[in-house]
Interface confidence: low
């Protein structure tokens, strides 16, 4: 069957839209009237209250839309709505760093139904966004390359559809945990893929299989750059008990949403934080997350590391290839940004059993204490570890070393760090030295060698 609409054209339930393994039911999308796609414009001039706009000359010109700014569309996913706080929060963070037309796309008329139907309704949403982009081009000479479409869950595939319909001329699409069911393993025509925009970046946060783990997001790479924070499956802070999950810092409603789909929602929270942390989400190219956590992917290669989220488009190699995979760790609550350091400690003093910790002090801030090694502490041995600091300390000025004994030792042995090397993710090294040794639980300050 096929159904046609005046502005948006025709929609078929033929393969691959329906009747394939991943979507066996023959279902058509609802009508544009029923999906009721709405465009809610926030700008630097109206950051708190949206202006509802349409693909119409008088509507756009009567609004705060500015043709000399970039336009970022944000498309929500299944069961969600365009007036939900998270979309406006993305806009508000954007206004802190740029002048922009920020358009939240509401399609709750089509998202609040069964999942299979909603997964078809995104075709209408994508067509509406494409129509809007084409209208801006024809009416205002506005280049699609100045358009960025950000889509969460089903919204990521709606963004892909918009990109496909505009022949890949849209500047950028960001997929925030693109939905897995009815999309993973399907032909590119159906789902988000790298041909949908000049640049496609993706954040995967809920990549466990839908059966039996209820992972709503895709594990499949679908962009030029695909980021797998914390491995892309289980996000830190999402394994809280039910009560603390629901009574969330952001309120009962956000807590309830988190309880239902915490990993899946993390993607847009990471993106929101990334806007105001331009270097706090460095993604490391690596064979797998296991290899990354084994400390084998540090520092960034000579071409640098891309930043997950808002600043991914600054990466020089962003479109060198498709399916480039990157790994990183984040925090367990906002602010989710982290700065990774490698610390190598050369020991001095007595041989004891214990563990050593180091804290970093720089021109931008100071870190907590991070454990570098646990076991037998031998003089002249060197131990290395990588950790993710919740503070960007900047250029290192000094480090502090402390050690703890694992057993009671009446001889009160002294241990020191003759040299500590700190390496940042861009490969910058700072060397610190001290001739001193200290008893356990006493801080030792090391200064530049």
């Amino acid at each position: 069957k096929e159904v046609c609409y005046e502005r948006l054209g025709c929609f078929s339930d033929d393969s691959p839209w329906s009747g394939i393994t991943e979507r066996p039911l023959h279902i058509l999308p609802w009508s544009p009237k029923d999906v009721n796609t709405r465009f809610l414009l926030y700008t630097n001039e109206n950051p708190n209250n949206f202006q509802e706009v349409a693909a119409d000359s008088s509507s756009i010109s009567g609004s705060n839309f500015k043709t000399n700014r970039k336009t970022r569309f944000i498309i929500h996913g299944f069961i969600d709505k365009g007036e939900e706080n998270w979309l406006a929060n993305v806009c508000k963070n954007l206004f802190k760093v740029e002048s922009v037309n920020c358009i939240c796309v509401d399609w709750k008329g089509g998202s609040r139904t069964g999942y299979t139907q909603a997964s078809q309704n995104i075709r209408i949403v994508g067509a509406e966004v494409a129509y809007f982009v084409e209208f801006l081009q024809s009416a205002f000479g506005y280049s699609p390359s100045n358009v960025h479409v950000i889509g969460h869950s089903l919204g990521a595939h709606a963004a892909g559809e918009a990109g496909r319909r505009t022949n890949g001329t849209i500047g950028r699409i960001t997929g925030l945990d693109p939905a897995e069911p009815c999309f993973q393993g399907t032909p590119e025509l159906v789902r988000l893929d790298p041909s949908d925009a000049k640049f496609v970046d993706v954040i995967h946060t809920d990549g466990a299989p839908i059966v039996p783990n209820l992972g709503f997001g895709m594990s499949q790479v679908v962009g030029h750059l695909d980021f797998f924070p914390n491995g892309g499956v289980e996000m830190p802070g999402c394994k809280k008990n039910i009560l603390s999950q629901i009574v969330d810092i952001d309120g009962i409603w956000e807590g309830t949403r988190d309880f239902a789909a915490c990993n899946h929602l993390r993607s847009y929270k990471y993106y929101t934080d990334s806007i105001v942390n331009p270097d706090g989400f460095a993604g490391f190219p690596c064979a797998s997350y296991n290899v990354f956590t084994a400390n084998k992917c540090f520092p960034c290669p000579s071409g640098g590391c891309p930043q997950m989220g808002h600043y991914a488009d600054r990466y020089p190699g962003k479109t060198n290839d498709v399916g480039q995979k990157f790994y990183l760790d984040t925090g367990d609550a906002s602010n989710f940004a982290r700065w990774r350091y490698k610390v190598s400690v050369t020991l001095s003093g007595k041989k004891v059993t214990g563990h050593i910790l180091v804290s970093l002090f720089g021109n931008k801030g100071n870190s907590k204490q991070y454990e570098i090694f646990k076991g037998t502490l031998k003089p002249d041995s060197t131990h290395s570890n990588e950790f993710d600091s919740d503070v960007d300390v900047g250029d290192l000025q000094m480090v502090k070393f402390i050690w703890y004994n694992n057993v009671i030792n009446p001889t009160l042995p002294r241990v020191g760090a003759s040299k500590i090397i700190v390496e940042t993710n861009v490969g910058k090294q700072f060397n610190f030295c001290s001739p001193e040794t200290v008893r356990e639980e006493v801080l030792l300050t090391l200064t530049p060698c």
Partner: nanobody
Framework: QVQLQESGGGLVQAGGSLRLSCAAS????????MGWFRQAPGKQRELVAS???????NYADSLKGRFTISRDNAKNAVYLQMNNLKPEDTAVYYC????????????????WGHGTKVTVSS
């Protein structure tokens, strides 16, 4: 009543140049974007170039470097300098402007000229 009047079209040999002009007249409060579109026989109307009141320009990718759009806000006019013309540039060229008529607060309406024909012979 607002009107757009194009001029400057005609027959030119490949490699030659033409300058199109378009002036808006009538009861005008302000003009937002002005631009040029073209329609070749049997094809859809397509954007050639546009310019905002602040001077920001936008060109069809295929025409960058050969065509230059400019604007005189005081005269409510827009110009298109076309160099190194090719036979595939043959089309009717239309002026387009987004105009707020006098007494119309902030509503903007899209106005079109009647078109001027450009023929490039090989």
């Amino acid at each position: 009543q607002v009107q757009l009047q194009e001029s400057g079209g005609g027959l030119v040999q490949a490699g030659g140049s033409l300058r199109l002009s378009c002036a808006a007249s009538g009861s005008i409060s302000s003009i937002n974007v002005m631009g040029w579109f073209r329609q070749a026989p049997g094809k859809q109307r397509e954007l050639v170039a546009s310019i905002t009141s602040g001077g920001s320009t936008n060109y069809a990718d295929s025409l960058k470097g050969r065509f230059t759009i400019s604007r005189d806000n005081a005269k409510n006019a827009v110009y298109l300098q076309m160099n190194n013309l090719k036979p595939e540039d043959t089309a009717v060229y239309y002026c387009n402007a987004h105009i707020t008529p006098a007494g119309s607060s902030n509503y903007v309406y899209g106005y079109w000229g009647h078109g001027t024909k450009v023929t490039v012979s090989s």
